[in-house]
């Protein structure tokens, strides 16, 4: 417990102190007091630096004194032989003796008392920044007018904090400006503007005079600006050393002015204003900004439009433009949106053709469609190449976004027909010689494939059976072989309107307009054994002359049997119509004069007994195309004849091209179109 006074005596005092002893006393007086320690008797073995025996006085880490020898008072009125005054409330006294004493020494007697200290004057460091007031056992600090005592109860400062500026424009100065600012102060000013505005501070050099930095460059008094995580300063010196215009990029600014105890100058004055927060003019690739400005600020809205061939995509949908707003944080909204190349996607496949796998499906990419050659060709020669257009479609220069059509190549047999042996008088043939040949099983007859959906035949073949079963692609019509060939299913039969329907067809003598079309349910796939024959052109080039050769094919009656199982064919010339008229009808069902001959009929045959016969009806009389020798066209259809092995009559197809085209057009599916 601290005491106000006390006595300290060496061991055995006033008898001689023992050898080899060490004893210490800890003196403590109350806080706010110093200690007055005085010795009234001192008799300790003398040695140099009191190395043998000594009494030591220690305050904290400091030795206040070390005593030995004999002392007597200099003052006849005072018993004090040695004294110490310390301004601290703790003191340690240590007595030490060595192993021997040459004489008898009696030691020491000492007393201590608590004494008041003057904190205001007794220390090198003044405890108060302004006024220091001493009292017994302590002191207190006080401040001049307009200053206040800080929480540390020692320092005085001016009350210059707490101001919050919210106006869009304002002026702030250091206390007393332009008179010297107060010492030992920390002034904090806050500027808080509406979100979307940045604080801009402006200072003039001459409006700034703050105590200069020390030799190490540290400001003794300083002005600092803090905006979020950015700091400007500290600034000090004569004339403002920083930028005269500070764009803080923040709507909140803290101004901190700190001063020390000395070196007051006139201080500073600044102006601030709120600028709409700027947003950077970003370089967004593949797009244009509207309106275009040198500077964009808070609340500005731009329309960002993608260049042709670019779009903004979200999920499965896209847009070619979007809006972006300069926001209160100085950043653009929708900055995640980027104009990227339009993707036309995987190109659609086409019937009877293919598209090569594109390296890319993005804007500007090119793809090429091809048809399955040699059986199909592209309807439009320039229809093969498509590029990915800005609207996200694959586009062709001629067809636009429409897909190309692969249409069957007509009139080109895979293998040319070669007569080996002398239908009647004809030769064996292979279906590859006549891939257009269609077999009708009831009645046993023929027809010609003219495209994917249509078969041309004679009207008399289908007048009695409007749902005929047809086959393509087989040389043999044996039942077992037909099972493996392609069966065609009719959707509708169209008989020429000029064909006269009879109650008893067997007695027919008028075969005028003996032509019909069969519309198929499903398209026929072309190949080496199945492909169409061409139709004649409308020009005079396709007018037949006597002697022009044509090919006929079918499974009709031969010399040896009523029906052929394997395909037969013959080459025969066109003859004048009178040649057919002159032949006597074999089994007339009427008077010979009753048989009708018209310009819609072609007469052919008469050479070496080669002719078509019962069972060949509807098959094509194929003539080489005068404008393209590689192709055959259907000049005629096997219709009727006076007598097998002589001359035969064929429907003149050229006269019906308009009807054929019109019928097909009016009855096509959208896919065909």
């Amino acid at each position: 417990e601290p005491t106000m006074y006390g006595e300290i005596l060496s061991p055995n005092y006033p008898q001689a102190y023992p050898s080899e002893v060490e004893k210490s006393w800890d003196i403590e007086v109350p806080e706010g007091y110093g200690i007055h320690l005085y010795f009234t008797h001192l008799d300790i073995e003398l040695s140099e630096n009191c190395a043998y025996d000594s009494v030591q006085i220690i305050s904290g880490d400091t030795e206040e004194g070390r005593l030995c020898g004999q002392r007597s008072s200099n003052n006849p009125h005072s018993p004090i032989v040695e004294e110490f005054q310390v301004p601290y409330n703790k003191l340690q006294v240590i007595f030490k003796s060595d192993f021997s004493n040459e004489e008898r020494f009696t030691g020491f007697a000492a007393y201590y008392v608590a004494t008041d200290i003057n904190e205001c004057t007794d220390f090198v460091d003044v405890p108060c920044s302004h006024f220091c007031n001493n009292f017994i056992g302590g002191y207190f600090c006080s401040c001049p007018p307009e200053y206040f005592l800080h929480d540390d109860m020692k320092n005085c400062g001016v009350n210059c904090s707490g101001d919050v500026f919210t106006a869009l424009i304002g002026e702030i100065a250091s206390p007393n400006y332009p008179k010297p600012y107060p010492e030992n102060s920390r002034c904090e000013y806050q500027i808080r503007l509406e979100k979307g505005f940045q604080v801009v501070v402006t200072l003039r050099r001459e409006d700034f005079d703050v105590e200069a930095a020390d030799s190490a460059g540290n400001c003794l008094d300083s002005l600092v600006f803090v905006a979020g995580d950015r700091q400007f300063g500290p600034y000090c010196g004569h004339g403002f050393p920083g930028p005269l215009n500070i764009e803080t990029k923040s709507n909140a600014l803290d101004i901190i002015f700190q001063t020390d105890l000395t070196g007051q100058k006139k201080g500073w004055k600044l102006r601030y204003h709120g600028d709409p927060m700027p947003c950077p003019k970003e370089d967004t690739p593949n797009s244009v900004w509207e309106p275009a400005k040198a500077k964009y600020v808070f609340r500005d809205v731009v329309q960002i439009t993608c260049l042709d061939g670019f779009e903004v995509v979200e999920g499965r949908v896209g847009a070619t433009s979007f809006y972006s707003t300069c926001q209160s944080n100085g950043k653009w909204s929708n900055s995640k949106l980027k104009c990227q190349p339009v993707d036309c996607g995987i190109p659609e496949s086409i019937e009877n053709g293919k598209v090569e796998d594109p390296e890319s499906t993005l804007f500007g990419s090119v793809i090429r469609y091809t048809c399955e050659e040699p059986y199909y060709y592209m309807e439009n020669e320039e229809g093969g190449e498509y590029h990915c257009a800005g609207n996200g479609s694959w586009v062709n220069e001629v067809l636009g976004p429409e897909l190309p059509k692969c249409v069957p190549v007509c009139g080109v047999p895979r293998e040319p027909f070669e007569e080996k042996q002398r239908i009647i008088g004809g030769s064996d043939a292979d279906i590859k010689n006549f891939p257009w040949q269609v077999f009708f099983d009831n009645p046993w007859a023929g027809g010609a494939l003219i495209n994917e959906y249509w078969v041309l035949t004679a009207a008399h073949v289908v007048e009695g059976n409007r749902e005929p079963t047809m086959y393509v692609g087989s040389t043999s019509v044996q039942t077992s072989r037909l099972a493996k060939s392609k069966m065609l299913t009719p959707e509708h039969v169209f008989i020429h309107p000029g064909w006269k329907l009879l109650e008893v067809p067997e007695g027919r003598t008028n075969f005028d307009n003996d032509i019909a079309l069969v519309r198929l349910k499903d398209p026929v796939k072309m190949g080496p054994t199945v492909s169409p024959i061409c139709l004649p052109g409308t020009s005079s080039d396709y007018n037949l002359m006597d002697g022009d050769l044509g090919l006929i094919s079918g499974w009709g009656r031969t010399e040896k049997r009523d029906r052929a199982v394997r395909l037969k064919a013959a080459r025969l010339p066109v003859a004048p119509l009178r040649k057919c008229k002159e032949v006597k009808v074999e089994k007339p069902t009427a008077d010979a004069e009753a048989y009708v001959f018209t310009p819609n009929m072609i007469c052919a045959g008469g050479e070496k007994g080669m002719d078509s016969c019962k069972g060949d009806s509807g098959g094509a009389f194929a003539v080489q195309d005068p404008n393209d020798k590689t192709k055959f066209y259907a000049a005629g259809l096997v219709s009727w004849g006076p007598q097998c092995g002589t001359y035969g009559l064929y429907t003149r197809v050229k006269n019906y091209v308009d009807w054929i085209m019109k019928t097909m057009q009016e009855n096509s599916t959208p896919r065909e179109d």
Partner: antibody, heavy 116, light 107 residues
Framework: QVQLVQSGAEVKKPGASVKVSCKAS????????MHWVRQAPEQGLEWMGW????????IYAQKFQGRVTITADTSTNTAYMELSSLRSEDTAVYYC?????????WGQGTLVTVSS | DIQMTQSPKSLSASVGDRVTITCRAS??????LDWYQQKPGQSPKLLIY???YRYSGVPSRFSGSGSGTDFTLTISSLQPEDFATYYC?????????FGQGTKLEIK
């Protein structure tokens, strides 16, 4: 497929805070904005604010400024909305939504009831 | 802030009817306007974006038009599943604001 799954319903006392989570799957939230929209009972939709999870930029509607905090944890692909100093008029269904061009996907909603 | 005003507030119609809902912005929002459909107890669903583009999977009977301040959502032939509340929303500038909604009920 794209999904936003929100945390369950909450009952809070006035003055308290609530934190609603929105876990995304089927996409990376860093590539989108994550919005929060609320709907008081029998009322319309009210946009509260958004976050760009890529850089934690946020924009709040003035009405909620100072009371709402939207955050995102890109490691768990989750967005959060915290509303403090709750009052009875904050009783609503809170939705998170994903956007670039528009609010194409929404969470199922979280009912927050504020009652003493 | 931009205010969005929808009209009518509610509307009764029959299956097969043609219905039009309008939305007016307090200032020009160009074409930055979206339409949403919300059924009771469900989250809103996007129907139309950028004023006139139908979102993927939305039936063709829904169409949007307009630019600037006046916008329209049209349902050409109402189906039973279309009875719901419809909201417009501007995404021209933050804060993104919604209309107060139009409740479409069965007559």
């Amino acid at each position: 497929q794209v999904q936003l799954v929100q945390s369950g319903a909450e009952v809070k006392k006035p003055g308290a805070s609530v934190k609603v989570s929105c876990k995304a799957s089927g996409f990376n939230i860093k590539e989108y904005y994550m919005h929060w929209v609320r709907q008081a009972p029998e009322q319309g939709l009210e946009w509260m604010g958004w976050i760009d999870p890529e850089n934690a930029d946020t924009i709040y509607a003035q009405k909620f400024q100072g009371r709402v905090t939207i955050t995102a944890d890109t490691s768990t692909n989750t967005a959060y909305m915290e509303l403090s100093s709750l009052r009875s008029e904050d009783t609503a269904v809170y939705y998170c939504a994903r956007s670039r061009l528009f609010f194409a996907y929404w969470g199922q909603g979280t009912l927050v009831t504020v009652s003493s | 802030d931009i205010q969005m005003t929808q009209s009518p507030k509610s509307l009764s119609a029959s299956v097969g009817d043609r219905v039009t809902i309008t939305c007016r912005a307090s200032q020009d929002v160009r074409t930055a306007l979206d339409w949403y459909q919300q059924k009771p107890g469900q989250s809103p669903k996007l129907l139309i974006y950028s004023a006139s583009y139908r979102y993927s999977g939305v039936p063709s009977r829904f169409s949007g038009s307009g630019s600037g301040t006046d916008f329209t959502l049209t349902i050409s032939s109402l189906q039973p599943e279309d009875f719901a509340t419809y909201y417009c929303q501007q995404q021209y500038t933050t804060p993104y604001t919604f209309g107060q909604g139009t409740k479409l009920e069965i007559k």
